[in-house]
Interface confidence: low
């Protein structure tokens, strides 16, 4: 027999199917030009020493074969002895290791069997009424197709589905959409209405995310506030990656989950912009303010659930820098200016009360005064910090107040409002004999001691009523007792206590008169 012809003789090997699970499969035969035809197949198993024979039986019952050797593709013309206008049955027999392995048969009319392509190029994926819709342009000159899809998840095998007949320049398919797992889809096509026509190859994988993006499971840590008044937000644990089916691992366009970080600065509510959304990869610097942070996951179908955290305010206070002067017209604060043209936000809130009671004031952009200080003043009538209680004050600064991530903390401190000197006056001063020349003085703590860092010291003053001599004794703010010694018996003394702040001298308490009795010896 000539190699270009189908040989109508017995093939050169015994006729016995081994029944092996390996062997030829997926036989496809097509017309590739006006007078040429091609059959191709796949072979599963070791290929060494395998010879393939394309078998063909005509409707008359006569059968022939082409010897393909080790190739799994064979071309022949319409002059090869195979009837191309009538139905023929084709299969592949592979002779290997002294046994024959047969492919499943295909029965078709070769002349009308056109090689169909799978969907090529861009397959658009969208969601439609809880289902997945895939759409693609019909390959050139191939309008009229049956389309199938197969899909799998990371934990399930391939499942086959039907897209139905297609008869347009664009083709589409409705497929199941999984709620919580990614899917891999592949599509294939074959000629519509042509009995026995071969399926195309499967398309490249189409990777589809779950309808619901995975809830982000991340953990943050916040570094300490630096000298510049900013602290870095760092990601301690990356979001768990979506598990992907086998064909989507590596590069899987379509299944990407985007994680965005939404910052909400809770402090300083009087500023222009309170929220900002960033990519999770770009971790921001924050001021020492309180923030709510949300991580929002989204995929091509939209946003999913978010995970939220509260980042408390940095309450580390410096014994700095805030000078407060109280005058008849009002109160002025002074602090070291940050830079030229800075906007400051001054926030205050009564200590021990809900953060919702914070009040703030935004300054106009200001330059440092000649002493390098920035200032904020308010009148008594404004009522700001007017009550005799402890306030927590934070001052934030920004050259770009509209940008949430560019605020920094200038300082945090405590301030006792209202008439601090009067309210801070120590009460319940008492004097007790201690020895022949000393007494013990103690008092109830000043109201100022409720405000951390505000009470600088107590001062105890003792006055000799005879000589009018006065002595003053500083006492640590944590102490409420002192021993006065070197006193003389029979002399009248008065004692008073004062509570001082860094910027304000307190009001003396009511004078306490006492004397040490003269001891009469027997």
């Amino acid at each position: 027999c000539r190699t270009s012809e189908c040989c109508f003789q017995d093939p050169p090997y015994p006729d016995a199917d081994s029944g092996s699970a390996s062997g030829p499969r997926d036989l496809r035969c097509y017309r590739i030009s006006s007078d040429r035809y091609e059959c191709s197949w796949q072979y599963e198993g070791p290929t060494a020493g395998v010879s393939h024979f394309l078998r063909c039986c005509l409707s008359s019952g006569r059968c022939c074969y082409f010897a393909a050797g080790s190739a799994t593709r064979l071309q022949f013309s319409d002059q090869a002895g195979v009837s191309v206008l009538y139905t023929v049955t084709l299969w592949v027999e592979s002779w290997a290791r002294n046994q024959t392995e047969k492919s499943p048969e295909v029965t078709l009319q070769l002349y009308n069997s056109v090689k169909y392509e799978p969907p090529l190029g861009d397959i658009k994926v969208s969601k439609l009424a809880g289902q997945l819709r895939m759409e693609w342009e019909t390959p050139d000159n191939q309008v009229g197709a049956e389309v199938q899809f197969r899909h799998r998840t990371p934990s399930s095998p391939w499942k086959l589905g039907d897209c139905g007949p297609q008869d347009d320049d664009t083709e589409s398919c409705l497929c199941p959409l999984e709620m919580n797992v990614a899917q891999e889809f592949q599509l294939r096509r074959r000629q519509l209405g042509s009995q026995g026509s071969s399926w195309s190859k499967w398309s490249s994988p189409v990777c589809v995310p779950p309808e619901n993006p995975p809830q982000p499971q991340v953990r943050f840590s916040v570094e300490q506030l630096g000298q510049d008044g900013r602290r870095r937000l760092t990601l301690k644990e990356q979001p768990t990656q979506l598990e992907l089916p086998e064909g989507c691992q590596g590069l899987a366009p379509g299944t990407e989950v985007t994680y965005r970080l939404q910052l909400h600065m809770l402090s300083c509510p009087c500023k222009a912009k309170a929220t900002r959304t960033l990519h999770l990869g770009k971790m921001p610097y924050l001021s020492g303010a309180a923030y709510n942070v949300a991580v929002i996951s989204s995929n091509q179908f939209g946003p999913g659930l978010n995970q939220t955290w509260h980042i408390p305010a940095d309450t580390h206070t410096e014994p700095v820098a805030l000078n407060i002067s109280v005058g008849t017209n009002g109160t002025t604060m002074y602090w070291p200016a940050r830079a030229q043209s800075m906007t400051y936000c001054i926030e205050w809130q009564p200590v021990g009360q809900d953060g919702g009671l914070a009040t703030c004031s935004l300054t106009a952009p200001q330059d440092p005064d000649p002493a390098g200080m920035a200032t904020y003043s308010w009148s008594r009538e404004s009522g700001a910090m007017g009550q005799e209680k402890c306030y927590y004050i934070t001052i934030f600064a920004s050259a770009h107040p509209e940008k949430l991530t560019l605020w920094s903390t200038v300082l945090s401190t405590y301030h006792f409002g209202g008439n601090a000197s009067a309210a801070g006056t120590p009460h319940h001063v008492s004097v007790k004999n201690h020895s022949l020349d000393s007494v013990s003085v103690d008092w109830a703590p000043s109201l100022l001691s409720t405000c951390p860092g505000v009470l600088k010291e107590y001062v105890v003053r003792c006055r000799d009523e005879d000589s009018k001599q006065v002595s003053e004794h500083p006492v640590q703010p944590t102490e409420t007792q002192v021993t006065l010694s070197g006193l003389r018996a029979g002399v009248a003394y008065t004692v008073q206590v004062r509570a001082d702040t860094a910027w304000l001298r307190g009001v003396w308490s009511q004078p306490q008169r006492f004397s040490i009795e003269v001891q009469v010896s027997d």
Epitope: A21, S22, G45, R150, P154, S156, P157, L160, E246
Partner: antibody, heavy 119, light 110 residues
Framework: QVQLVESGGGVVQPGRSLRLSCAAS????????MHWVRQAPGKGLEWVAI????????YYADSVKGRFTISRDNSKNTLYLQMNSLRAEDTAVYYC????????????WGQGTMVTVSS | QSVLTQPPSVSAAPGQTVTISCSGS????????VSWYQQLPGTAPKLLIY???KRPSGIPDRFSGSKSGTSATLGITGLQTGDEADYYC???????????FGGGTKLTVL
């Protein structure tokens, strides 16, 4: 030739452990999901466990969950079943089976290895 | 108790036709492909039908499969004494994330 060969069966006392192996040849082992299926004497087939391609996902029948562990070593073309806390009802022929690439059919089966749990 | 239900036994004379049913639910047969396995006495199971109705190479066309809704059927025509075996249906169960089998049907050729 595509082949699966199980080993490691034998007689074991209740509460003890046993490890079965399944050596694969003639195909790309790392591309296929693999099953363990068992058959008690005179009874039907009972699926035991499956492990996917790279070993990143595993599922078990409720009857063995927490006691049996399926694993694979793709570099050695070998599937394993670690069986702990064995019970009399685990007595069976244990088959390993290959999952077809294109569907959920088990297209290749081993010859089986007998496990007898008896005191 | 198997997830899939098969008749325990069927019998017919040589040359006759026999069918074996397999019923399940939407989470298994309803949404997944059914496979059929033949187990000749003393041997390992062998794949007979996959994807509801396809035959692997080497399986004669006397064996056929079909599926409708949540049930599947194996058909064997031209019965031969060599067909005496246990036949099992199997499929994936999407809810259980497990492979499920029927209890098996013993075919006797009279």
């Amino acid at each position: 030739q595509v082949q699966l060969v199980e080993s490691g069966g034998g007689v074991v006392q209740p509460g003890r452990s046993l490890r079965l192996s399944c050596a694969a040849s003639g195909f790309t082992f790392s591309s296929h999901g693999m099953h363990w299926v068992r058959q008690a004497p005179g009874k039907g087939l009972e699926w035991v466990a499956i492990i996917w391609y790279a070993g990143n996902k595993k599922y078990y029948a409720d009857s063995v969950k927490g006691r049996f562990t399926i694993s694979r070593d793709n570099s050695k073309n070998t599937l394993y079943l670690q069986m702990n806390s064995l019970r009399a009802e685990d007595t069976a022929v244990y088959y390993c089976a290959r999952e077809s690439l294109l569907n959920s059919a088990s297209d290749i089966w081993g010859q089986g290895t007998m496990v007898t749990v008896s005191s | 108790q198997s997830v899939l239900t098969q008749p325990p036994s069927v019998s017919a004379a040589p040359g006759q036709t026999v069918t074996i049913s397999c019923s399940g639910s939407s989470s298994n047969i309803g949404n997944n492909y059914v496979s059929w396995y033949q187990q000749l006495p003393g041997t390992a199971p062998k794949l007979l039908i996959y994807d509801n109705n396809k035959r692997p190479s080497g399986i004669p066309d006397r064996f056929s499969g079909s599926k409708s809704g949540t049930s599947a059927t194996l058909g064997i025509t031209g019965l031969q004494t060599g067909d005496e075996a246990d036949y099992y249906c199997g499929t994936w169960d999407s809810s259980l994330s497990a492979v499920v089998f029927g209890g098996g049907t013993k075919l006797t050729v009279l």
